[in-house]
Interface confidence: medium
């Protein structure tokens, strides 16, 4: 049987096949993919802008940031208000004070420790 390079198309991930000769073809890949048949998802994480210890997770022609618990937002630049998330973070009447990348407790009546429990 006659071999036709682009029938069926060997290009994957939405790539477009173009016949370049009797037995040769070329794949034009969609943004985010590379390789002779567009088989590879390009790693978009080099020069990522995840901040505050965020980890870059590659996508297709984009990436996302996986943030540590104290940070949120697209690039982990927004502080999580632990005092709102944990109303009882401070014990024994202590006042919760949100800080960039964490929180602290202001203790009263002789109590001490990170959560005023000592």
């Amino acid at each position: 049987s006659l071999y036709v390079p682009c029938a069926p198309s060997p290009c994957v991930n939405g790539g477009t096949c173009r016949q370049t000769g009797d037995f040769t073809f070329e794949c034009n890949c969609l943004p985010g993919f590379e390789g002779s048949t567009c088989e590879r998802n390009i790693d978009d994480c080099p020069n990522h802008r995840c901040q505050n210890g965020g980890v870059c997770v590659d996508g297709v022609n984009t990436y996302n940031c996986r943030c540590p618990p104290q940070w949120t937002g697209q690039f982990c630049t927004e502080d999580v208000d632990e005092c709102l998330l944990q109303p009882n973070a401070c014990q024994n009447g202590g006042t919760c004070a949100n800080r960039n990348g964490g929180y602290g407790c202001v203790c009263v009546n002789g109590w001490s420790g990170d959560d005023c429990s000592e």
Partner: antibody, heavy 117, light 112 residues
């Protein structure tokens, strides 16, 4: 679209701020770079302000000589102490992919800065 | 600082001919994020190609980009008078190791 303004004749040492005004897209999504071109010379990248993180990066030769800042619709380039070598057309250019530096697919017409005593 | 070298500062071609412009990087371009621009006098640069080989929307398929790593090429086939311009390569590099972006010195294409 993007359009530069503020270019004029200045004497050496006189600080000058150029403004790039954008419309039709958000500066919170796209990186913006400044590029210059001296008369009859090639393109020279000055620096970038990144979308989202607002991180600034400058070309090694440009550090301390230029300052980039932005508002919601403008990107400024301050030439801190111009010298005659800073005579050039200054272009504002938008990154072509959201949150990736990559390439520049939208350029302003440029604004001419002439530094002379 | 990262450097992009365009070996020829000018090239000449006949109408209908082929022009090849080379661009060499001093270190690897991030993910082949290498672009080509066309600039005519008094105008800003116009994006032709990005990602080393992806044609920008609306640009003639006579323009073809190839290469990877540190060696890249722009080929113009079936050269037309309108192709007379200066062509620049531009690459993205790791910001952590120096300049994020660099341009080549440009190659002027003249039509015979």
């Amino acid at each position: 679209s993007v359009e530069e303004s503020g270019g004029r004749l200045v004497t050496p040492g006189t600080p000058l701020t150029l403004t790039c005004t954008v419309s039709g897209f958000s500066l919170s999504s796209y990186d913006m770079s400044w590029v210059r071109q001296a008369p009859g010379k090639g393109l020279e990248w000055i620096g970038i302000i990144q979308a989202g993180s607002n991180t600034l990066f400058y070309a090694s030769w440009a550090k301390g000589r230029f300052t980039i800042s932005k508002t919601s619709t403008t990107v400024d380039l301050k030439i801190t102490s111009p010298t005659t070598e800073d005579t050039a057309t200054y272009f504002c250019a938008r990154g072509g992919v959201i949150f990736i530096i990559g390439h520049f697919n939208l350029w302003g017409p440029g604004t001419l800065v002439t530094v002379s005593s | 600082a990262q450097v992009l070298t365009q070996t020829a500062s000018s090239v000449s071609a006949a109408v209908g001919g082929t022009v090849t412009i080379n661009c060499q990087a001093s270190q690897s371009v991030v993910n082949n994020r290498l672009a080509w621009y066309q600039q005519k006098p008094g105008q800003p640069p116009k994006l032709l190609m990005y990602g080393a080989s992806t044609l920008e929307s609306g640009v003639s398929s006579r323009f073809k980009g190839s290469g990877s790593g540190t060696q890249f090429t722009l080929t113009i086939s079936g050269v037309q008078c309108d192709d007379a311009a200066t062509y620049y390569c531009q690459g993205e590099f790791l910001c952590s190791s120096g300049d994020c972006v660099a341009f080549g010195g440009g190659t002027k294409v003249e039509i015979k």
